[in-house]
């Protein structure tokens, strides 16, 4: 494959990454799959400035990010280390709340209306953000 040098149409560039902001809702797994089909991943937030960039574009709306603990510990979908990385949880979160009556706890992270993060039931149909790095090799064949 060839390296991407600019963002696809309808994607927004910021600090050598491209972002796509949904305007509809999907369950976390469906959102994750959507991004993968676009040769991208659900957004991985690595700094406060990136957090603010994403906040600016999504507004005060619940929105999935690429962070989950469905297999035990919290993990970023691109392998970024959770423990040493940027975190922006709301106070008292994550709490793996079981009181919602939907079965199980809360294993997927989303941006809340104030931008900070909450864990929620992964089946909820929230908006989502895809991210892909400009410098990574594209799966598309090079143009001849």
């Amino acid at each position: 494959g060839s390296e991407r040098t600019c963002c696809p149409v309808n994607w927004v560039e910021h600090e050598r990454s491209c972002y796509w902001f949904s305007r509809s809702g999907k369950a976390w797994a469906d959102a994750d799959n959507y991004c993968r089909l676009e040769d991208a991943h659900l957004v991985v937030v690595t700094s406060w400035e990136e957090q603010k960039f994403v906040q600016h574009h999504i507004g005060p709306v619940n929105t999935w990010m690429g962070l989950h603990d469905q297999n035990g510990p919290w993990k970023w979908v691109d392998g970024t280390d959770y423990e040493t990385g940027f975190k922006n949880w709301r106070p008292e979160q994550p709490d793996d709340w079981y009181g919602h009556g939907l079965g199980g706890g809360e294993d997927c992270a989303h941006f809340t209306d104030d931008g900070r993060w909450n864990d929620d039931v992964c089946q909820r149909p929230y908006r989502w953000v895809c991210e892909t790095e400009l410098d990574k090799a594209s799966q598309e064949p090079p143009l001849l």
Epitope: E49, F53, F86, K87, P91, D114, G115
Partner: antibody
């Protein structure tokens, strides 16, 4: 009502240390980030530092990095600024302000405490 | 670091006048632009956040606009209590920085 009261200011010699405190009341202190902002006599505002609601993240203005440390004690509803290796240019009124989690502005401010660094 | 500039540095106006203060950032700050008012010997008071959102309790004669790097604060009809110094601040990237201020005094 939200109230922020700074204390600990005074006259100190260059190279010495001072610790400022900001006592908070009227809101759930442990749920809010907090800022320190300073203002030299007759000058404009200068942002100094911010700390997250749980103390897990801290950011500083370049000129105070390595000399100033922001901290908090949520059990005492108090914010601190430990200032070491003080310089004449640190002379200012120091304000604490409550952070807005989305926009990072100061929505409530204390009345300020004056720090004078002079030999 | 992001530098913030303001113009003018001072202005003289009369009660009832409309005034506009501009603020420019050295790079994009998206919508993370706030305005404060400060009177002598007092703490700053938040007027506007997020470019154009009026803080609770602030009179509607204050308004903000702009995007990216260029912003403005407008006071539609100056009142006696509006004579003060006004500061813009970016809260996009640390260190958060203030403009140098604009002093509005009585003509």
């Amino acid at each position: 009502q939200v109230q922020l009261v700074e204390s600990g200011g005074g006259v100190v010699q260059p190279g010495r240390s001072l610790r400022l405190s900001c006592a908070a009341s009227g809101f759930t202190f442990s749920s809010y980030g907090m800022h320190w902002v300073r203002q030299a006599p007759g000058k404009g505002l200068e942002w100094v530092s911010v700390i997250w609601y749980d103390g897990s993240d801290k950011y500083y203005e370049d000129s105070v990095k390595g000399r100033f440390t922001i901290s908090r004690d949520n059990s005492k509803n108090t914010l601190y600024l430990q200032m070491n290796s003080l310089r004449a240019e640190d002379t200012a009124v120091y304000y604490c302000a409550r952070d807005h989690p989305r926009w990072s502005y100061g929505d409530y401010w204390g009345q300020g405490t004056l720090v004078t660094v002079s030999s | 670091d992001i530098q913030m500039t303001q113009s003018p540095s001072s202005l003289s106006a009369s009660v009832g006048d409309g005034v506009t203060i501009t603020c420019r950032a050295s790079q994009t700050i998206l919508s993370y632009l706030n305005w404060y008012q400060q009177k002598p010997g007092k703490a700053p008071k938040l007027l506007i956040y997020g470019v154009s959102s009026l803080q609770s309790g602030v009179p509607s004669r204050f308004s903000g606009s702009g995007s990216g790097t260029d912003f403005s604060l407008t006071i539609s009809s100056l009142q006696p209590e509006d004579f003060a110094t006004y500061y813009c601040q970016q809260s996009y990237s640390t260190p958060f920085t203030f403009g140098p201020g604009t002093k509005v005094d009585i003509k």
